[in-house]
């Protein structure tokens, strides 16, 4: 009886089970009762990453430098090229098809997490006792200066954007 289902890494065609082509190879011709499935290796800059019956290999992804992209991992006959972004840029999507400049955290905000090739800068508001007076993609919120430890007193209170201003203590006559 002709099969109705096939084993893993096989496919059903013309009432018989044929072997799938292994990753890195494409289908040239289906098997017969006399011959195995005929497969051919993918060409340069092509790949197939699964057991398959594809008649054409996929083209490796192109990491376009005009879009801020560079190669993170070169593709093989079994894997696609992995792109990432140039320094100071990050991917706009999981597929990393283009890049944008890392955002900077405005004054009053500090960097919670520095950007990577795939994620943007994460900013957080400076809490009480901390400040940031610059727009930066790297600077965290800094703690206000402790006037007391310098034997000084606060002359001007700090904000989320400015440090405290310390001054000498008034001497009692």
């Amino acid at each position: 009886e002709p099969p109705t289902a096939c084993r893993e890494k096989q496919y059903l065609i013309n009432s018989q089970c044929c072997s799938l082509c292994q990753p890195g190879q494409k289908l040239v011709s289906d098997c017969t009762e006399f011959t195995e499935t005929e497969c051919l290796p993918c060409g340069e800059s092509e790949f197939l990453d699964t057991w398959n019956r594809e008649t054409h290999c996929h083209q490796h992804k192109y990491c376009d430098p005009n879009l801020g992209l560079r190669v993170q991992q070169k593709g093989t006959s079994e894997t696609d090229t992995i792109c990432t972004c140039e320094e100071g840029w990050h991917c706009t999507s999981e597929a990393c098809e283009s890049c944008v400049l890392h955002r900077s955290c405005s004054p009053g905000f500090g960097v919670k997490q520095i950007a990577t090739g795939v994620s943007d800068t994460i900013c957080e508001p400076c809490p009480v006792g901390f400040f940031s007076n610059v727009s930066s993609a790297f600077e965290k919120c800094h703690p206000w200066t402790s006037c007391e430890t310098k034997d000084l007193v606060v002359q001007q209170a700090g904000t989320n954007k400015t440090d405290v201003v310390c001054g000498p203590q008034d001497r009692l006559r």
């Epitope: 011709s29 017969t32 011959t35 195995e36």
Partner: antibody, heavy 117, light 107 residues
Framework: EVQLVESGGGLVKPGGSLRLSCAAS????????ISWVRQAPGKGLEWVAS????????YYPDNVKGRFTISRDNAKNSLYLQMNSLRAEDTAVYYC??????????WGQGTLVTVSS | EIVLTQSPATLSLSPGERATLSCRAS??????LHWYQQKPGQAPRLLIY???QSISGIPARFSGSGSGTDFTLTISSLEPEDFAVYYC?????????FGGGTKVEIK
């Protein structure tokens, strides 16, 4: 017991025709592809033709394509090879062989075809 | 067409010796290769299929190995009845092709 018995061989003049038969028994003939393989005197094995179990697909090497025709009658458990425009180089023992697991797992004893003037 | 080259053409050995027969394909054929034995005046007999799979009823002294382009048939200890011609056959693509054969003869 699986058995394949060839017949129809003989002496034929160049340009002539011959029809070989292969009678099968001991297995469900209609479930198997069958091939013809030949062997010239003192030489190696050479594939000649194959036919799928249902008879809908046939395969030939270039040197016999257009001259030889493989066919089968599943109701009669029989395989045939019609050979036309025969040449001296077609002289050989012709075997029919069953295809099991894509291998020629059972063979007949062969029939001799001699093409000579 | 895939060309199969068998070597040596003739192998002269004594009973009890180990026989190593080679079959080389002109292009990669994965494990899509069979081995046959033929004795004088007889039809060929299937010995090994898919390069290394043993056949029921074939003595365990016959074994096959290899994949890609290089294949080997080994007879671990020759018996008198093993002196014959051995053929490899590829079924990776059309046309089906056989090697030229290796004759194993008594030394």
């Amino acid at each position: 017991e699986v058995q394949l018995v060839e017949s129809g061989g003989g002496l034929v003049k160049p340009g002539g025709s011959l029809r070989l038969s292969c009678a099968a028994s001991g297995f469900t003939f209609s479930n198997y592809g069958i091939s013809w393989v030949r062997q010239a005197p003192g030489k190696g094995l050479e594939w000649v033709a194959s036919i799928s179990s249902g008879g809908d697909n046939t395969y030939y090497p270039d040197n016999v394509k257009g001259r030889f025709t493989i066919s089968r009658d599943n109701a009669k458990n029989s395989l045939y090879l019609q050979m036309n425009s025969l040449r001296a180089e077609d002289t050989a023992v012709y075997y029919c062989a069953r295809a099991g697991e894509k291998a020629m797992d059972y063979w007949g004893q062969g029939t001799l075809v001699t093409v000579s003037s | 067409e895939i060309v199969l080259t068998q070597s040596p053409a003739t192998l002269s050995l004594s009973p009890g010796e180990r026989a190593t027969l080679s079959c080389r394909a002109s292009q990669t054929i994965n494990n899509n290769l069979h081995w046959y034995q033929q004795k004088p005046g007889q039809a060929p007999r299937l010995l090994i299929y898919y390069a290394s799979q043993s056949i029921s009823g074939i003595p365990a002294r016959f074994s096959g190995s290899g994949s890609g382009t290089d294949f080997t048939l080994t007879i671990s200890s020759l018996e008198p009845e093993d002196f014959a011609v051995y053929y490899c056959q590829q079924f990776s693509s059309w046309p089906l092709t056989f090697g030229g054969g290796t004759k194993v003869e008594i030394k």
